[in-house]
Interface confidence: medium
């Protein structure tokens, strides 16, 4: 029977800068029941607080709801593991919510083949930002990436769309069925998951000639 091993805070994520969750991995339990607590303070302050919500994020997590989330402050947190034989602490983790945003995937992905008479045909792709993100405040800049491929192909073709929420693609293989997906990323944060795939059949008479 031993004191617990050192826990490790391995991830923090926020869907929108308004709430966030951090997760830890327990160390060895030393063969005894072990209790875990996450404590934190804000940079420049000495007052320590305990995790406000150990439930919402699932096992070995701490969730910070709206009332506990400040955008312009750095949180300094650590996890304490305790059993009858002693305690151990994780390394301190510094968290500024700006740097942990991982949005939900973009919504309402629409794909259409456009064949104007006077110009080249193209694939028109349009989407909406995820609902939890409020772009009107100016706090957020979302960048988008599109990927597409013929249904049976192994390799994805990737296009960076910048801040646009629509995109045109000119070079496609006629007669093929394509999968199209989009994802988004805030300026300092993480890429979202890819949106569910939308399928589009490219007509056989779709021509890439001038």
């Amino acid at each position: 029977q031993l004191p617990p091993g050192k826990p490790e805070i391995f991830k923090c994520r926020s869907p929108n800068k308004e709430t966030f969750t951090c997760w830890w991995r327990p160390g060895t339990d030393g063969g005894l029941p072990t209790n875990y607590s996450l404590t934190y303070h804000r940079e420049g302050e000495t007052l320590m607080h305990e995790c406000p919500d150990y439930i919402t994020g699932g096992p070995n997590s701490c969730h910070f709801g709206k009332q506990y989330t400040s955008m312009w402050r750095t949180y300094i947190m650590m996890v304490n593991a305790t059993n009858q034989m002693g305690s151990s602490f994780s390394d301190e983790l510094y968290v500024d919510v700006t740097y942990i945003v991982q949005p939900d995937p973009p919504l309402e992905l629409a794909v259409e083949v456009k064949q104007p008479e006077d110009r080249k045909p193209y694939l028109w792709i349009k989407w909406s930002p995820p609902t939890l993100i409020d772009l009107k405040t100016g706090w957020f800049t979302l960048l988008y990436e599109i990927r597409l491929k013929p249904e049976k192909a192994a390799e994805w073709e990737i296009h960076f769309a910048g801040q646009q929420t629509e995109f045109k693609i000119l070079s496609l293989h006629p007669g093929q069925k394509y999968l199209v997906q989009v994802r988004c990323k805030p300026d300092h944060g993480y890429w979202s998951a890819w949106s569910p795939a939308t399928f589009i059949q490219i007509p056989s008479d779709f021509t890439m000639n001038d």
Epitope: E8, I9, F10, K11, C12, R25, T74, D91, L93, Y94, V95, D96, V97, Y99, I100, Y190, W191
Partner: antibody, heavy 123, light 110 residues
Framework: QVELLESGGGLVQPGGSLRLSCAAS????????MSWVRQAPGKGLEWVSS????????HYADSVKGRFTISRDNSKNTLYLQMNSLRAEDTAVYYC????????????????WGQGTLVTVSS | DIVLTQPPSASGTPGQRVTISCSGS????????VNWYQQLPGTAPKLLIY???QRPSGVPDRFSGSKSGTSASLAISGLRSEDEADYYC???????????FGGGTKLTVL
Amino acid sequence: QVELLESGGGLVQPGGSLRLSCAASGFTFSSYWMSWVRQAPGKGLEWVSSVSDTGTDTHYADSVKGRFTISRDNSKNTLYLQMNSLRAEDTAVYYCAKTPLAYSSGWYYFDYWGQGTLVTVSS
Amino acid sequence: DIVLTQPPSASGTPGQRVTISCSGSSSNIGSNTVNWYQQLPGTAPKLLIYRNYQRPSGVPDRFSGSKSGTSASLAISGLRSEDEADYYCQSYDSSLSGSVFGGGTKLTVL
């Protein structure tokens, strides 16, 4: 406990290539930025390159830009440095270093280091 | 190129207090934190001070760090023979998008 074990060093001719590996254990490799730092014989430390936790962001020192490529395989807990067009001035001990988890600006440092692998570029 | 400036050498007698300086610019020390490493002969560097003044567990409180403007310093009090090593300061440089080191200071315990 955290362990970083470099391999792949050796003697190579100018203009040649070498691929260094760093096997990591004792921590959640996929959560951390990782870096390469080198030290020429009898000289100081020089940062070479860093890669983000997911592998999507990479940064290089000007002295190696366009010649070296950093990458990682999170499924194998391994960091790589592909070194092409090697020059005599690339001769050094190459250290693999872990960057602590920190989600804020201006915090960048190296909390664990491997023992290093020697790369000698000479004809 | 060495971006942060350190004195090449420093020395002191056992029990003495020694200070090593590190000078940078607004794009590194001026806007980011400073870290210090100790490299004993023939070994890999070891983190000594992080975020200007924090000590990792296991580092004695004889070692302390401070930062002011675009300069930082490492102080070692109660100098011991085992402190004889090379000491490097390091920061992040926002304009280079990378890490920068000082040239190192060789500390001799007389």
